[in-house]
Amino acid sequence: MAVTACQGLGFVVSLIGIAGIIAATCMDQWSTQDLYNNPVTAVFNYQGLWRSCVRESSGFTECRGYFTLLGLPAMLQAVRALMIVGIVLGAIGLLVSIFALKCIRIGSMEDSAKANMTLTSGIMFIVSGLCAIAGVSVFANMLVTNFWMSTANMYTGMGGMVQTVQTRYTFGAALFVGWVAGGLTLIGGVMMCIACRGLAPEETNYKAVSYHASGHSVAYKPGGFKASTGFGSNTKNKKIYDGGARTEDEVQSYPSKHDYV
């Protein structure tokens, strides 16, 4: 029950996280105009991964896409790539985890297969979350660097007569959405990995010991010890007791009515 709950919760948390990563990637507010010195501005600038926007105080908003690929900073391209990889991995992870859910029965899928799929999706969620966190953090670092660079030469003038105020950008809402979403996806992935351990059938098959009583001589044949982790090739629930000392792995050559366990 706890395993199902952990798996289900991991799936839901990851689902929310990936939805957040998608939302953050699509959002226009990755960087917003710094309003520290001027809280009320007639023209407000903000930028996303795909386009930059200007909102005028009168209500008019205009967005323009980055219609160049080569002209964009390498860092921005890297952030785009990280976010897209995160989304793709997360989407595949979600697809895999749907089939892995314990509460959903698909044909005669065994628990070991579900455990494998749960682990796979968990790892995908972890990598997806890390990609998102990395992407957002790279962008945030880029913003911090540019912020202090623009602060250093905040005012550039012609003979000190005319002031040109340089627009500074600070963290936008998308960064926080991305960090939280990445974190949730990561947590969801960890939960899936934990659930996977509980799903794996813990098989400790103690093979029978055979005693062959033939006159005075006692033949002692020890059975092998096998503990299945659930990831082996032979993951069927084994029939441990089969009348005598025989197992499905090992058939005795000379069965006898005097065989005991």
């Epitope: 007639a42 930059s52 009168s58 040109t164 627009t167």
Partner: antibody, heavy 118, light 113 residues
């Protein structure tokens, strides 16, 4: 097309409060515009007083901020200007105007002359 | 506050001739976000409210004749009437639409010579 019409008393006594209303037709006051008040003293230039925008936020000219209040009544599709403690220097033609793209005033009312005199 | 200074204060031009009005702002009106200059031009005829001519320094408002054009960037702007018509006699104002408070130039009166 949006049409604006100012209304209010043409004569106000010094130290009293000037109250004007702008009635909007052909559009909603809740639509994505800013609704401004601008004045023009006789024979002089234009001065922006302030605005109330689509979300109800106001912004005033700092030179008049302590005396100005702009409000709106969405049910009547009107917005209003209140200017307290008026003096003869506040005598002007008062215009209401709509600003949108480029923060430019695209629609104007015909204006109403307000004289401050005892 | 951004101070807008227009020149000349008045201008007399013959019909069909070019009229040029200058406007200078004390701060740049160029927004780096969209590379647009937030300067607007208005025409005001006697007894009428101002009429929007040009916004974003060079974008003509719909319905405005193409003889009106705006140019300039940063702090220096120009309104040009390529061929003055009798109906163009008016006072022309430039406006800072970039920074609060929105401010107007003192106006330039255009007359026929």
């Amino acid at each position: 097309q949006v049409q604006l019409q100012e209304s209010g008393p043409g004569l106000v006594k010094p130290s009293e409060t000037l109250s004007l209303t702008c009635t909007v037709s052909g559009g909603s006051i809740s639509s994505n515009y800013a609704w401004n008040w601008i004045r023009q003293p006789p024979g002089k230039g234009l001065e922006w007083i302030g605005y109330i925008n689509y979300s109800g936020n106001t912004n005033y000219n700092p030179s008049l901020k302590s005396r100005v209040t702009i409000s709106r009544d969405t049910s009547k599709n009107q917005f209003s200007l209140k200017l307290s403690s008026v003096t003869a220097a506040d005598t002007a033609v008062y215009y209401c105007a709509t600003s949108y793209y480029g923060n430019s005033f695209i629609y104007w009312g015909q204006g109403t002359l307000v004289t401050v005199s005892s | 506050d951004i101070v807008m200074t227009q020149s000349p204060d008045s201008l007399a031009v013959s019909l069909g001739e070019r009229a040029t009005i200058n406007c200078k702002s004390s701060q740049s009106l160029l927004n780096s976000g969209n590379q647009k200059n937030y300067l607007t031009w208005y025409q005001q005829k006697p007894g009428q409210p101002p009429k929007l001519l040009i916004y974003w320094a060079s974008t003509r408002e719909s319905g405005v004749p193409d003889r009106f054009s705006g140019s300039g960037s940063g702090t220096d702007f120009t309104l040009t009437i390529s061929s003055l018509q009798a109906e163009d006699v008016a006072v022309y104002y430039c406006q800072n639409a970039y920074s609060f408070p929105w401010t107007f130039g003192q106006g330039t009166k255009v007359e026929i010579k």
